[in-house]
């Protein structure tokens, strides 16, 4: 059985205020069963950015159809970027558990920073 890897190919993503940012994340295995969530930051202070299962995240759309059985692409787009959105974003795999899912593995993170507007 192949060990799950969380791949976030970009270490740094330069974005423009007001535009849409695409954060890439793919997994190498469908196991263990459980959701992939997106966070900004690490530790107890991290911000939940996207959870497919619950909540309403109006600025976030997924690149792929997460409901497809064999989907391994958990990339997201965040629209209407502001300076308050800068930080490092992590896709995190959770293992299905009872009563709560358990964090299993995190991607290496993608730092989102503001780039100069194109002239």
């Amino acid at each position: 059985e192949e060990e799950l890897q969380m791949i976030q190919p970009e270490k740094l993503l330069l974005v423009t205020v007001g535009k849409t940012a695409t954060l890439h994340c793919t997994v190498t295995s469908l196991l263990p069963v459980g959701p992939v969530l997106w966070f900004r930051g690490v530790g107890p202070g991290r911000e939940l950015i996207y959870n497919q299962k619950e909540g309403h995240f109006p600025r976030v759309t997924t690149v792929s159809d997460l409901t497809k059985r064999n989907n391994m692409d958990f990339s997201i787009r965040i629209s209407s970027i502001t300076p308050a959105d800068v930080g490092t974003y992590y896709c995190v795999k959770f293992r299905k558990g009872s009563p709560e899912n358990v964090e299993f593995k995190s991607g290496p993170g993608t730092e989102m920073a503001l780039g100069a507007k194109p002239s």
Partner: antibody
Framework: VQLVESGGGVVRPGESLRLSCAAS????????MNWVRQAPGEGLEWVSR????????DYAESVKGRFTISRDNSENTLYLQMNSLRAEDTAVYYC????????????WGLGALVTVSS | ETVLTQSPATLSVSPGERATLSCRAS??????LAWHQQKPGQAPRLLIY???RRATGIPDRFSGSGSGTDFTLTISSLQTEDSAVYYC??????????FGGGTKVEIK
């Protein structure tokens, strides 16, 4: 969406009070929450914010070191522990749900009146 | 720190007339500006977000416009129930979240 504050009352300067905000009608654990206050006859003043998981907090300078925001996601409840209260803390305190992690306040509670007076 | 200045402080408008409220930011806030309505003795209620998007259930007589530093809330045909204080809020830079000082709309 419903937000109901409780715990307000009359206290003397230097005393403490804890406000609660019971949330229902939405996935509480997915959203950042805030406290906003309004002194009598005045405008709105943001007090504090807590992130969805409860580990990240921010405070207005006027309350830093005296107030502590917290949440219990299993009970769908937001708290504001207010210590060393001053007369200028007298206000209606509203809890407010945040639209997303970096956003405006889309739902407000009815408010709890806190009066600090000797 | 971004300061929001609302004008006028008080606006008296006859029923059926147009009310125009202004909110000016001390530095750009992009389109990240919301408007809240607060009726006497009640909690605030979200009207407009992202400068021009109406919140759920808000009548279409309320509209928002502007970007950068200058924003406008327009009530196209004032109703008696629109008597309230209106606050703008920016969420481009935070913390802290900032509100304007408010505009009180009175019915003539």
């Amino acid at each position: 969406v419903q937000l109901v504050e409780s715990g307000g009352g009359v206290v003397r300067p230097g005393e403490s009070l804890r406000l609660s905000c019971a949330a229902s009608g939405f996935s509480f654990s997915s959203y950042a929450m805030n406290w906003v206050r309004q002194a009598p006859g005045e405008g709105l003043e943001w007090v504090s914010r807590i992130n969805s998981g409860g580990g990240g907090t921010d405070y207005a300078e006027s309350v830093k070191g005296r107030f502590t925001i917290s949440r219990d996601n299993s009970e769908n409840t937001l708290y504001l522990q207010m210590n060393s209260l001053r007369a200028e803390d007298t206000a209606v305190y509203y809890c407010a749900k945040q639209y997303d992690w970096n956003g405006f306040f889309d739902y407000w509670g009815l408010g709890a009146l806190v009066t600090v007076s000797s | 720190e971004t300061v929001l200045t609302q004008s006028p402080a008080t606006l008296s408008v006859s029923p059926g007339e147009r009310a125009t409220l202004s909110c000016r930011a001390s530095q750009t806030v992009g389109s990240k500006l919301a408007w809240h309505q607060q009726k006497p003795g009640q909690a605030p209620r979200l009207l407009i977000y992202d400068a021009s998007r109406r919140a759920t259930g808000i009548p279409d007589r309320f509209s928002g416009s502007g970007s950068g530093t200058d924003f406008t809330l327009t009530i196209s045909s004032l109703q008696t129930e629109d008597s309230a204080v209106y606050y703008c809020q920016q969420y481009y830079y935070w913390p802290p979240y900032r509100f304007g000082g408010g505009t009180k709309v009175e019915i003539k």
